[in-house]
Amino acid sequence: PLATIPVSTTSLTSSEGSTISTPSVDISTPVTTSIVGDQCSRCKNGGFWDGLKCQCLTPYYGESCEEVVNSIDIAPPETVSAQMELTVTVTSVKFTDELKNHSSQEFREFNKTFTEQMNIVYSGIPEYVGVNITNLRLGSVVVEHDVLLRTKYTPEYKTALDNATEVVKQKITKVTTEQIMTNDNCSALMCFNTTGTQVQNITVTQYDPVEECRQKAEEYEDYFLVEYRDQKPYCISPCESGFNASKNCNHGKCQMSQNGARCLCVTTETHWYSGEDCNQGTQKSHHHHHH
């Protein structure tokens, strides 16, 4: 036997003024039907029947996946990062082929000293995580390395990381200008060739909550938007209450359609409500029925 699908109706009036009954299952829309055991379900909009209920795809929900959610979960990363590819020339160490071998004593000691030196140079940058040597080559020692930066995600993360990369440039330029060999002597942990300092490339984490929101909203992308609360982005439709963009339907219910958010106005025992925001009330005339 096929399971009966309960269809409840609510007396609602669209903002155009006509009274409509909105079934929880829209029979007029073609649906895919899957039969599992003796259960039958109509799951719309790509949803599938799991044996008990419809499993809906974002942004849909409801008994038959016929309704559009008011908000979509978007999850920005906890932290965002930047990677700067830099080159500096160290003059206080003689280049040997052993430096190319990352498991050699020469490389390990050079790496330790270079890392210590860079930790000192960048000590005042809160976003600084560390350095990673990618290649060492002749000349005295040309050090190709990455400077790693990280910060907590906030809407302004790009500005924070951009500022940090600028400070990195300033600090590496300063140290490689000041810590130089004089009279064949280097009195610092490491000495540099001023002209060998170059920033090759900067890569910053790309995260756009608006883009994620639009992608997840699919065909409703034009009607979902991102609003922030406590520096956290929320992907909402105008039907979600409590935000700047929230639609106030007064005496009605907000519903998403492919043309955007609209208000379905209620009819009470005493009033009809109409208007785009269901804020125009018309009192019903009272008829006396005699038995």
Partner: nanobody, 124 residues
Framework: EVQLVESGGGLVQPGRSLRLSCAAS???????MGWFRQAPGKEREGVAG???????GYADSVKGRFTISKDNAKNSLYLQMNSLRAEDTALYSC???????????????????RGQGTQVTVSS
């Protein structure tokens, strides 16, 4: 990691001599080596240094009295201290640079390996 172990310290009378030794666990041929000292309540100071190519440097206070040398074959560093004075009393430690370090002709250089030290007390 390079391990450095100092020896030769002790109690000595003013005007006498002492020879400090520093045994390294690895090759010191391609390293700058140095001796440092720290007296109670004072900052650590460079005493003497020797570069990879044998060039030496000394603190003004010890010039003409102390001599630094190294024996690459034995991976050892030495500090010959003559005409010792009461103000030479300190904990003496040896230090080594990273491999292939060049340009360490002054004593302000920061070495990356350092021993525990040996105590020298000059007193009558």
């Amino acid at each position: 990691e390079v391990q450095l172990v100092e020896s030769g310290g002790g109690l000595v009378q003013p005007g006498r001599s002492l020879r400090l030794s520093c045994a390294a666990s690895g090759d010191i041929t391609r390293r700058c080596m140095g001796w440092f000292r720290q007296a109670p309540g004072k900052e650590r100071e460079g005493v003497a240094g020797i570069s990879e190519d044998g060039i030496t440097g000394y603190a003004d206070s010890v010039k003409g009295r102390f001599t630094i040398s190294k024996d690459n074959a034995k991976n050892s560093l030495y500090l010959q201290m003559n005409s010792l004075r009461a103000e030479d009393t300190a904990l003496y430690s040896c230090a080594a640079s990273i491999l292939n370090r060049v340009g360490c002709r002054q004593l302000s250089y920061e070495y990356i390996y350092r021993g525990q030290g040996t105590q020298v007390t000059v007193s009558s």
